[in-house]
Structure formats: structure tokens, C-alpha cells
């Protein structure tokens, strides 16, 4: 499907509005520090050029690749060296090395100011004054803070963002209408960003085979009635879409995702009975809906897996003929029978099966050797089951905040070298697994919990990769994608850690804590808890609980005081002294 001009091809396919939105996302994800106005100018220049190519595909430069065109445009930014430092060196390279260089400089934790939400009336005025600029700003601000956000999905978020303002800015109580919607979009957006970040990490760090294995398992759970050939086709197409988006090829990615949604809906009879409602929706909603669709019912009377994968005399012959196809079929058959397992567990089982066949098919009596392979699965299945049972019991006993605190202590003791903000962010997210998954019945707990934990631990891995400080984190993050969670679970207290020097400033609080939201106040307290553990990694749960209870009482008391600042200064000194004594600091 060769086109004389790739830029003209994509411009015509997508239309101008989608083209401009996606180019803006791409540029903002690459140059995360550039001002909005500069990006808009670059996007307009690219769009005008695309139009000349639509008019005449033979015009000068129209035959260049999108990477060449976009890279050349990014490299015209005057302040590249001052703003981005060594990223400017990318511009001396030729494609495809230049794009790879830009990708390597994407920053998962850019030094950008927190997004402060203006007053509702101010937002509504801005929305009415220039709807297009308002929405472009949204795309820009999200894209630069989340450089791996799934671009076609960001269009869906922008559409919902627009709908919220369209509805709520004419409501009687604008704030009551708008704020919950914006909160929901923010929370969903963070979750979507983290899920996509895992997909990109999977592709970039572990390769296409790892991603395809994940996709086979997940799609087989979701579409258990689909034939293996159908699932394989969907996996191939989905891998192409995510490879493109993770590689910065956002126009191709969005175009291919639209084609995939169209294909799925045209072939839903051979894919899943659950797609009907999704397929009646407009494109952006439809694609989102398909990605989130519930698992179809398992076909009745599926035969035992053992017949084809253990008992058959042709196991080694079938494996030798096409190893990945045979393993893919094993994964498909196992996954479609087990919607109650996490994808990572299914992948561990497939890896165990593969290792067994590699060993046994070279043995004197292969069948005798692999006959008990399914017995090896039992401990692999029980480990996450037990872990989830224990942690859900703890969550139900403590509630979310205190459960997060338990995890903060646990993880700070495991990897105390990791920065406090990262430990707080990751542990808070790990703790959310309770509210998210423990409410589910047994059959849904493991896929919910363990696959969510994979997403959260990937956040730890990508943040740690930027400034590595712990060999243990590096080891768990890089050795095996599917064993990350068991690797972190198995870590004990780091006995090599030298406790941090005590710094009273870390535990000095001011009256401004009183005006913070409940969430922000929790983060302040949890930051203090991590610092405490870093000072005293051998502190017992009871000691830490006592100090935290005292701290909560201190904040409550001083926030009720007439002279808050004096209270924080005087009572704060007493609290620090009492805490030092309690912990033996």
C-alpha cells in the first residue's frame, strides 16, 4: 500500500482536525518543555505543508517520511540546546536514528508545574471564547506530562472534556456539574497513561514477542469463542497499532486503530457476543469501548487441555515444527479457559510449559519427562491467590489510607534508596488495588489485582530507570516482565542500607497543611512516614503507628488553634523530640 506522499495519505485519511490534533500530541510528547504557542505554530506549518502535498503529491519534499518531516520541523526550534541539553544532539543524526534518539529522551517525570484548575467561571469563559484553543491546550498539557499517552485514546478524552464543558457551562450550578466530571477524567487519564506505559515498556524493553504473548493471553480471555486464527490476526494488528504509538508514529497508529475497530465490528459474529453495544457508538467511543469490553462467555464443553498438550504423542513434533505457534495455541487454549487468572500468571504458566518442552523434547523419553508438567503449575497459581487473599484481608481490616501506609513501610524497607516522592506515589497506587479489586468475587480478583499491580510496578520501573539508585529495583525490573511482582514481593528488608541522617527540617510542618485537601494532607503524612522509615528502617509497626498517630493528633490540634503557625512551631519541636525518643533516633 505504497503512497507517493505519506503525509498527504494520512492527512486525507484522518481529515484536518484529527491530523492537527495528533501532530500536536506527537510534538508535545517529544518536546515537553516547549510553550503551547510554539507547538501550535509548528503544527500549523506542518499542516500547511501537508495541504500542498494533498494538492500535488509530487511537490518538493512530499515524498519524505513522516519521521523526516516531523524531525526536521522539531529541529528548527531555536532554543533546543538551552532547553533540552543533549537532546539537541539528536538533530545531528539521520533517520531512523534521530527518531530513536528523540524517543530515548522522552521524560516520564518532566519538571513541569502542577496543573492548577482555575475557577469554573474562568474555565467556561475560556471555553466559550475559543473552544478550539481550549481543547488544543488540553491535548498539549496532557501529552507533555504523559509522553507515552495512547494518542487516539487522548482524542477520546478530549472529546469527553469538550462534552463536559458544553453541558456544564450552561448548567445552573456549573461547579457541581463540571468538577466531578473533571475529577473522573483526571483519574481515568492517569490510569490510561499508566496502562499504556506498560505496553510501551513491554515492547521497548522486552520486544515484540513479549507484547504478542501478553496480547494473546488477554484477547483469548476476552474473546474465548473466537478461533485461534482470529485471535492471532487481532494480536498482529494490535501489536502494529501499539508499536506505532509507542514509537511516536501517531498518525499511522490512530489510522490503524480506526481500521482495527472497523474490522472487529464487521466481524463481531466470529469474535464476541459482547461487542454489539460498542459497535453502535461513534469511532472514538467505539474504540475505547472495545478496549474495555467485558469477557465473553466461555464456550460450553471445552475439552481438557491435557489431550493436546500433555497426552498427545505429537507434542514434541508439533512444538518443533513451529515453536511460537504451538506455544501461542497453548496460551490461547489456557487463557480462554481461565478468565479467573491474571495475564501475567498465564504467561508464567506458558513460560514453564516452554521450559519443560525445551528440556523434555531433547530427553530419551520426552513423554515420561513432560507428563507431570501441569503439576508444576499448582504453586504458580497458588502464590498470587494467597497473596491477594492476605492483602485483601489486610485492606478490609485497615481501609485504604492505612493499607497504603502498610505498603509504604513495606516498600521503603525493601528499597529505601528510592526517592521519597516515588515511594509515596507508587505505594499509594499499590494501595488502591484494595478498593479497586477486593470488592470483586474470587473469580475476578486475581486478573484485577495482579494485572493492576503490573501497571503500578512499571511506574516504579520507569521512574527508577531515569535515575537508578537501587540494584534490587533494577534487577526486578529488567530480569523478567512477568515476574516483576513476585520479584518485588520476595524482597526482604535491605540489610545493606545505611539509615539516612536525621534532619529536623524534614519533619517541620506549617499552617499551610491545614488548607490542603484531604488527599494532599495524606500525601504530606505519608511523605513523613517514608522519611521515618528511611531514618529507622528497623522500627516496628507498633512504633511507627504510635508516631503516626501522634503526628495526626498534632496536625488536628494545630489546625484548630487560633495561632496555627506558633502551634506548629512549638508543638512540632515537641513531636520531633518525642518521636526521636520513641524510635531511639
Amino acid at each position: 500500500d505504497a503512497h507517493k506522499s505519506e503525509v498527504a495519505h494520512r492527512f486525507k485519511d484522518l481529515g484536518e482536525e484529527n491530523f492537527k490534533a495528533l501532530v500536536l500530541i506527537a510534538f508535545a510528547q517529544y518536546l515537553q518543555q516547549c510553550p503551547f504557542e510554539d507547538h501550535v505554530k509548528l503544527v500549523n506549518e506542518v499542516t500547511e505543508f501537508a495541504k500542498t502535498c494533498v494538492a500535488d503529491e509530487s511537490a518538493e519534499n512530499c515524498d519524505k517520511s513522516l519521521h523526516t518531516l516531523f524531525g526536521d520541523k522539531l529541529c528548527t526550534v531555536a532554543t533546543l540546546r538551552e532547553t533540552y541539553g543533549e537532546m539537541a544532539d539528536c538533530c545531528a543524526k539521520q533517520e531512523p536514528e534521530r527518531n530513536e534518539c528523540f524517543l530515548q529522551h522522552k521524560d516520564d517525570n518532566p519538571n513541569l508545574p502542577r496543573l492548577v484548575r482555575p475557577e469554573v467561571d474562568v474555565m467556561c469563559t475560556a471555553f466559550h471564547d475559543n473552544e478550539e484553543t481550549f481543547l488544543k491546550k488540553y491535548l498539549y498539557e496532557i501529552a507533555r506530562r504523559h509522553p507515552y499517552f495512547y494518542a487516539p485514546e487522548l482524542l477520546f478524552f478530549a472529546k469527553r472534556y469538550k462534552a463536559a464543558f458544553t453541558e456544564c457551562c450552561q448548567a445552573a450550578d456549573k461547579a457541581a456539574c463540571l468538577l466531578p466530571k473533571l475529577d473522573e477524567l483526571r483519574d481515568e487519564g492517569k490510569a490510561s497513561s499508566a496502562k499504556q506505559r506498560l505496553k510501551c515498556a513491554s515492547l521497548q524493553k522486552f520486544g515484540e514477542r513479549a507484547f504478542k504473548a501478553w496480547a494473546v493471553a488477554r484477547l483469548s480471555q476476552r474473546f474465548p469463542k473466537a478461533e485461534f486464527a482470529e485471535v492471532s490476526k487481532l494480536v498482529t494488528d494490535l501489536t502494529k497499532v501499539h508499536t506505532e504509538c509507542c514509537h511516536g508514529d501517531l498518525l499511522e497508529c490512530a489510522d490503524d486503530r480506526a481500521d482495527l475497530a472497523k474490522y472487529i465490528c464487521e466481524n463481531q459474529d466470529s469474535i464476541s457476543s459482547k461487542l454489539k453495544e460498542c459497535c453502535e457508538k461513534p469511532l472514538l467511543e467505539k474504540s475505547h469501548c472495545i478496549a474495555e469490553v467485558e469477557n465473553d462467555e466461555m464456550p460450553a464443553d471445552l475439552p481438557s487441555l491435557a489431550a493436546d498438550f500433555v497426552e498427545s504423542k505429537d507434542v514434541c513434533k508439533n512444538y518443533a515444527e513451529a515453536k511460537d505457534v504451538f506455544l501461542g495455541m497453548f496460551l490461547y487454549e489456557y487463557a480462554r479457559r481461565h478468565p479467573d487468572y491474571s495475564v501475567v500468571l498465564l504467561l508464567r504458566l506458558a513460560k514453564t510449559y516452554e521450559t519443560t518442552l525445551e528440556k523434555c523434547c531433547a530427553a530419551a523419553d520426552p513423554h515420561e519427562c513432560y507428563a507431570k508438567v501441569f503439576d508444576e503449575f499448582k504453586p504458580l497459581v497458588e502464590e498470587p491467590q494467597n497473596l491477594i487473599k492476605q492483602n485483601c484481608e489486610l485492606f478490609e481490616q485497615l481501609g485504604e489510607y492505612k493499607f497504603q501506609n502498610a505498603l509504604l513501610v513495606r516498600y521503603t524497607k525493601k528499597v529505601p534508596q528510592v526517592s521519597t516522592p516515588t515511594l509515596v506515589e507508587v505505594s499509594r497506587n499499590l494501595g488502591k488495588v484494595g478498593s479497586k479489586c477486593c470488592k470483586h468475587p474470587e473469580a475476578k480478583r486475581m486478573p484485577c489485582a495482579e494485572d493492576y499491580l503490573s501497571v503500578v510496578l512499571n511506574q516504579l520501573c520507569v521512574l527508577h530507570e531515569k535515575t537508578p539508585v537501587s540494584d534490587r529495583v533494577t534487577k526486578c525490573c529488567t530480569e523478567s516482565l512477568v515476574n516483576r511482582r513476585p520479584c518485588f514481593s520476595a524482597l526482604e528488608v535491605d540489610e545493606t542500607y545505611v539509615p539516612k541522617e536525621f534532619n529536623a527540617e524534614t519533619f517541620t510542618f506549617h499552617a499551610d497543611i491545614c488548607t490542603l485537601s484531604e488527599k494532599e494532607r495524606q500525601i504530606k503524612k505519608q511523605t513523613a512516614l517514608v522519611e521515618l522509615v528511611k531514618h529507622k528502617p528497623k522500627a516496628t509497626k507498633e512504633q511507627l503507628k504510635a508516631v503516626m498517630d501522634d503526628f495526626a493528633a498534632f496536625v488536628e490540634k494545630c489546625c484548630k488553634a487560633d495561632d496555627k503557625e506558633t502551634c506548629f512551631a512549638e508543638e512540632g519541636k515537641k513531636l520531633v523530640a518525642a518521636s526521636q525518643a520513641a524510635l531511639g533516633l
Epitope: F11, K12, D13, L14, G15, E16, E17, N18, K20, A21, K51, V54, E131, E132, L135, L155, A158, K159, K162, D255, A258, D259, A261, K262, P282, L283
Partner: nanobody, 131 residues
């Protein structure tokens, strides 16, 4: 949501004319770029023509340029396809489609020309050109 109903198809001799109409009901019609696609028996659905939200920008596939004209009347929630100098190879089911996108850009933005970027579809109207 938007419902689209095509009309105006029929049997016509080569060289003749037809005017297809597509009436939209539901949400604000001017929020959508509109397109016409066609599907001949045993073939893929193909793009014919599209028009921007304001009607200021129009696009045609090469094989119909100079013969077909797309237009819209936002007051009547209708899009039209005037087909002149019809040829037997124009025989197909003609579908009207609406593309919403973000619906926030300029009303003259170029619409998408690919079927998978359209959000809503009509049931189609048969056009048969005999030789």
C-alpha cells in the same frame, strides 16, 4: 446520536443524472463533516465525496471529479450528491456518513476521506446505471 436516511437512488441510463439526498436527525447537523461512499457488489466500500462542516471545503475521488457535486444545507439538516454523466461503473449502493471527530476545529477543516473515521452511517440507496 445521529440517524441518516438516504434517498434518490434508482435506475438510470448511462449519461443520465440522479440527485441523492441524505437527511440527518438527532444532534446538531453542523457539528459533522459529511461524506458519500459507495460499494459495488463484491468490492470494498470506497470514498466518493466529502464536505466540511460549513460546506466551504469539498473533496472528490478522481473518477467522479467534474461529474459529481456534493453540497449541504445546514438549515435543512441535509447533504446532497448531484451525479451527472453517470457511467455503468458508478453502479453501487451509495452510503451517506457523518464524521464528528472532536468537532471543535474550524468549520472548514478538511473532512476525513477514509471510511473508518466516520462515526454514523445510513442504510444506503441503490444506484444502477445501465448501458
Amino acid at each position: 446520536d445521529v440517524q441518516l436516511v438516504e434517498s434518490g437512488g434508482g435506475l438510470v441510463q448511462a449519461g443520465g443524472s440522479l440527485r441523492l439526498s441524505c437527511a440527518a436527525s438527532g444532534r446538531t447537523f453542523s457539528s459533522y463533516a459529511m461524506g458519500w461512499f459507495r460499494q459495488a457488489p463484491g468490492k470494498e466500500r470506497e470514498f466518493v465525496s466529502a464536505i466540511s462542516r460549513s460546506g466551504g471545503s469539498t473533496y472528490y475521488t478522481d473518477s467522479v471529479k467534474g461529474r459529481f457535486t456534493i453540497s449541504r444545507d445546514n438549515a435543512k439538516n441535509t447533504v446532497y450528491l448531484q451525479m451527472n454523466s453517470l457511467k455503468p461503473e458508478d453502479t453501487a449502493v451509495y452510503y451517506c456518513a457523518a464524521a464528528e471527530g472532536l468537532a471543535s476545529g474550524s468549520y472548514d477543516y478538511t473532512p476525513p476521506l477514509k471510511s473508518s473515521w466516520y462515526d454514523y452511517w445510513g442504510q444506503g440507496t441503490q444506484v444502477t446505471v445501465s448501458s
